[in-house]
């Protein structure tokens, strides 16, 4: 029997029932490699509470349709006194990535999953050449899912201070160059997920091979390797490889763009701070609304409830389905059955069944998937109680006054599946807008101006045009809504600019589009503020002008006009200056544009060194000074000692010259023990220091790539700029 979804075959996938602390391993084409579940288990259930394993789906007992996959077992189970077999049922829906299997619910006998994936699409428009699983569960069964970062066309430009090369990457899948309008990517070879552009040439420096890995709490790693045998002439005989480390920010902040932290010998190290690396909780509710602080999610489906005897209708070929969700209005067809979903046979209206009751409902939100489940319907001939699973999709332009209408998509073993496009499923989620601008390879970053939470305060604009009595206060935040504190406490929740006077507060605009580079300055436009008459809404423009070293000055109100519909501010700030690389001496470096100063001398060890262990070697490194550890050379800044025979290599002479670019401090040690290659290249070490306010001194981590590249990454609070 041919595999129904070949794209999903190469991996064992995971799904979690968080409520019951159960981890499922799923292999839809073969068997999972778990001894306790037996040799032919396709779905293995690991109950972490009881520390037991059960096979709940056998690879041999598989049956499939276009959108449903069933795995039966030979294990009996008892449901309503009838004798059944335990089974797993996976409902497939078309998605834009390989996606993730999601646990829906489980009865005594059936374990239900839903999987939104390109593998289930009728057309191949979203299918990748190469794609790997893009999510992981941590030890606490919390999901970290990078699927939202996957680009369906185009790529992310990795931030790097080198003007001559550009590294483009995608997440977990290859770059689709055909559908990308940008000419730079056209030359990228097919299958590449990391494409290096040098002049008019493009090179494949990495393709996805393994899925996402969790290296430690809130830090995920994705590795790409170049599949082709031929070496690239600029890689000094090394095979290119790319490692992307996704870091969950230590507090709720906007994500950054990916940054190149090392690239010696074509071993490209990328760090990406993004909230998608943080775990996502599953939310569940027995009502039709739910909200979650951590996800910044708020959902209310109660407007979908029909009143006055009305109901929705959905066509199921042989049957009609009448639905009334989120309400307790009896569907007359299903008289006295308390049905939320009522199934009526088209050819015989006396054949009526409840396909789920309104007091047996669960609303579930996970990673953008919103599902409403109605249990406890009339029994089928098999003894199973009918149930309905409604998958909601956000559609801001849905008909029927935004409510949309449910569409029947299929049935398996008396479980009825519907999809429903509606504006009420549009989840208020975190912003995906960037707080910066680009102009070719020039980058501008306004994140230093963002105010996130107490004890920080909003920026208040200077307005010299008013007398004290008629004074208006203008509160501004950058790329973020204003903080509701102090005089801005009464400001509308989603206002990014807010005016406050004796009459109250006004929303002067929301952050709904990223900053733009215009005429040498940065323009930030906030729109969709309060109504200002004639069907118009207030709009605010902020022009940010580069002023090196100044992150303290406040914005100034320049004009307001169009009958109170338009406001213009000007802001002279270092945040509007182009990001540039700066060098420093004596273990310090000064970012003259932003006015930040960094001093890493507290990390220098007067005696000894920092030790980093790997399987075969011990590495000793110091910061801005020599390691004083025998058997290392006295002038080496880093040295490598073989555990087997204590053979030692100098990995570079110590120095105290730091370089700084966009939040990243680097220290390079060169001139170490030469390699045994033709050119006898001296060994070198690169240490990249990255900000982590909670890390204190922190410690170096060796980026284990190959035998001759010595990249260390060091998270430390000493790499954090002082908040201005």
């Amino acid at each position: 029997q041919a595999a129904p979804f070949p794209e999903l075959c190469s991996y064992t996938w995971e799904a979690v029932d968080t409520k019951n602390n159960v981890l499922y391993k799923i292999n839809i084409c073969g068997s999972v490699d778990i001894v306790q579940c037996g040799p032919s288990s396709a779905v293995c259930m690991h109950d972490l509470k009881t520390r037991t394993y059960h096979s709940v789906g056998d690879s041999v007992l598989r049956s499939a349709t276009r959108s449903l996959l069933e795995f039966n077992t030979t294990v009996s189970c008892d449901q309503q006194g009838t004798n059944h077999r335990v089974q797993s049922s996976i409902a497939f829906l078309c998605g834009k990535t390989l996606g993730t299997p999601e646990f829906v619910t489980a009865t005594e006998c059936v374990h239900y999953f839903e999987w939104r994936t390109t593998a289930a699409c009728k057309k191949d428009i979203f299918k990748a050449n190469k794609e790997v699983p893009c999510y992981v569960f941590d030890e606490e069964l919390r999901k970290h899912d990078l699927n939202p970062l996957i680009k369906l066309s185009g790529a992310y430009l990795v931030d790097d201070s080198d003007p001559d090369t550009s590294l483009f990457i995608n997440v977990c899948r290859d770059i689709d160059t055909l559908r990308d309008p940008g000419s730079q990517l056209r030359a990228c070879p097919p299958g590449t997920a990391a494409c290096l552009v040098r002049g008019h040439q493009a090179f494949d420096v990495g393709q996805p091979r393994d899925g996402l890995k969790l290296v430690r709490k809130d830090r995920l790693v994705l590795s790409y390797v170049r599949e082709e045998a031929g070496k690239l002439d600029f890689c000094d005989g090394h095979s290119p490889a790319v490692t992307i480390t996704f870091v969950c920010p230590s507090e709720r902040r906007e994500g950054t763009i990916p940054k190149l932290t090392a690239k010696s010998n074509c071993r490209y190290e990328i760090e990406w701070i993004t909230e998608y690396a943080c775990h996502r909780d599953y939310l569940e509710s027995k009502t039709c609304s739910l909200s979650g602080e951590q996800q910044d999610v708020s959902i209310d489906l109660t407007p979908l409830a029909q009143s006055g005897g009305s109901s929705y209708i959905s066509d199921g070929k042989e049957y009609l389905f009448y639905l009334n969700v989120c309400g307790e209005t009896e569907i007359q067809f299903c008289n006295k059955k308390q049905a939320a979903v009522c199934q009526v046979k088209k050819s015989d209206t006396s054949q009526v069944k409840a396909a789920g009751r309104y007091h047996n409902q669960t609303l579930r939100y996970s990673d953008g998937d919103l599902t409403l489940i109605y249990f406890g319907g009339d029994e089928c001939s098999s003894g199973f109680q009918r149930m309905s699973v409604i998958n909601f999709e956000c559609n801001k332009t849905a008909g029927n006054d935004g409510k949309g209408t449910p569409v029947f998509t299929g049935e398996v073993d008396c479980t009825y599946f519907f999809t429903w496009d509606t504006e009420y499923a549009c989840v208020k989620e975190k912003e995906d807008l960037l707080c910066g601008a680009t102009d070719g390879k020039k980058r501008y970053d306004l994140s230093a101006l963002v105010r996130h939470a107490e004890p920080e305060q909003n920026w208040e604009a200077v307005d010299g045009s008013q007398t004290e009595t008629e004074k208006k206060h203008f509160f501004i935040n950058i790329c973020h809504r204003v903080l509701q504190e102090g005089k801005a406490r009464g400001c509308p929740e989603d206002a990014a600019v807010c005016a406050v006077d004796k009459n109250g507060s006004k929303n002067l605009g929301k952050f709904i589009s990223s900053p733009m580079k215009e005429k040498g300055n940065i323009q930030l436009s906030y729109s969709d503020g309060d109504d200002c008459g004639h069907g118009k809404k207030i709009k605010t423009n902020i022009t940010l002008v580069c002023k090196p070293g100044d992150l303290e000055s406040a914005p100034v109100l320049r004009t307001s006009g169009e009958g109170g519909c338009f406001y213009e501010f000007e802001w002279h700030t270092a945040a509007a200056c182009v990001l540039s690389k700066t060098e420093g001496e004596n273990c310090t470096v000064f970012d003259s544009q932003a006015g930040f100063s960094f001093d890493l001398s507290p990390l220098t060890k007067k005696n000894g060194a920092y030790k980093v262990e790997t399987k075969k070697y011990d590495f000793y490194i110091n910061v801005c000074g020599p390691v004083s550890v025998s058997p290392c050379q006295p002038d080496s800044g880093a040295c490598q000692v073989a555990k087997s025979d204590e053979k030692t290599w100098n990995l570079g002479l110590s120095n105290a010259k730091l370089s700084y670019y966009d939040g990243m401090i680097q220290l390079n040690y060169r001139g170490g023990t030469p390699y045994n290659n033709e050119r006898h290249t001296p060994r070198a070490t690169l240490i990249t220091f990255l900000c982590d306010r909670d890390a204190g001194v922190g410690f170096p981590e060796y980026q284990e790539e190959d035998n001759s590249t010595y990249n260390f990454r060091w998270y430390t609070s000493y790499a954090c700029p002082e908040e201005p």
Partner: nanobody
């Protein structure tokens, strides 16, 4: 409760046309038509959801057209190319279970 008033039934020759109408006492969805021929079960003819496309029984597809006037809370069934096997009592149904009293349609050959 919802009051329904049906009209438009009658006797017609095969190949002829009839138009049924059903007025509800208030706004309600969906609105549609079912029928029951002597000795048979009641079956779907056509139904009009509050939004989206109408649903028709295979046997009437292309011959019958359902429409509604929201302002009048009324649903219509335009029946063309009638056949003897369309003979039945036609029932208006609204809201998923409220029934009209039925109107007889007889198609003679």
């Amino acid at each position: 409760e919802v009051q329904l008033v049906e009209s438009g039934g009658g006797l017609v020759q095969a190949g002829g046309s009839l138009r049924l109408s059903c007025a509800a006492s208030r706004s309600i969805s969906p609105m549609g038509w079912y029928r029951q021929a002597p000795g048979k079960q009641r079956e779907l003819v056509a139904i009009m959801p509050s939004s989206g496309t109408p649903i028709y029984a295979d046997s009437v597809q292309g011959r019958f057209t359902i429409s509604r006037d929201n302002a009048k809370n009324t649903v219509y069934l335009q029946m063309n190319s009638l056949k003897p096997e369309d003979t039945a009592v036609y029932y208006c149904n609204v809201g998923g279970g409220y029934w009209g009293q039925g109107t007889q349609v007889t198609v003679s050959s």
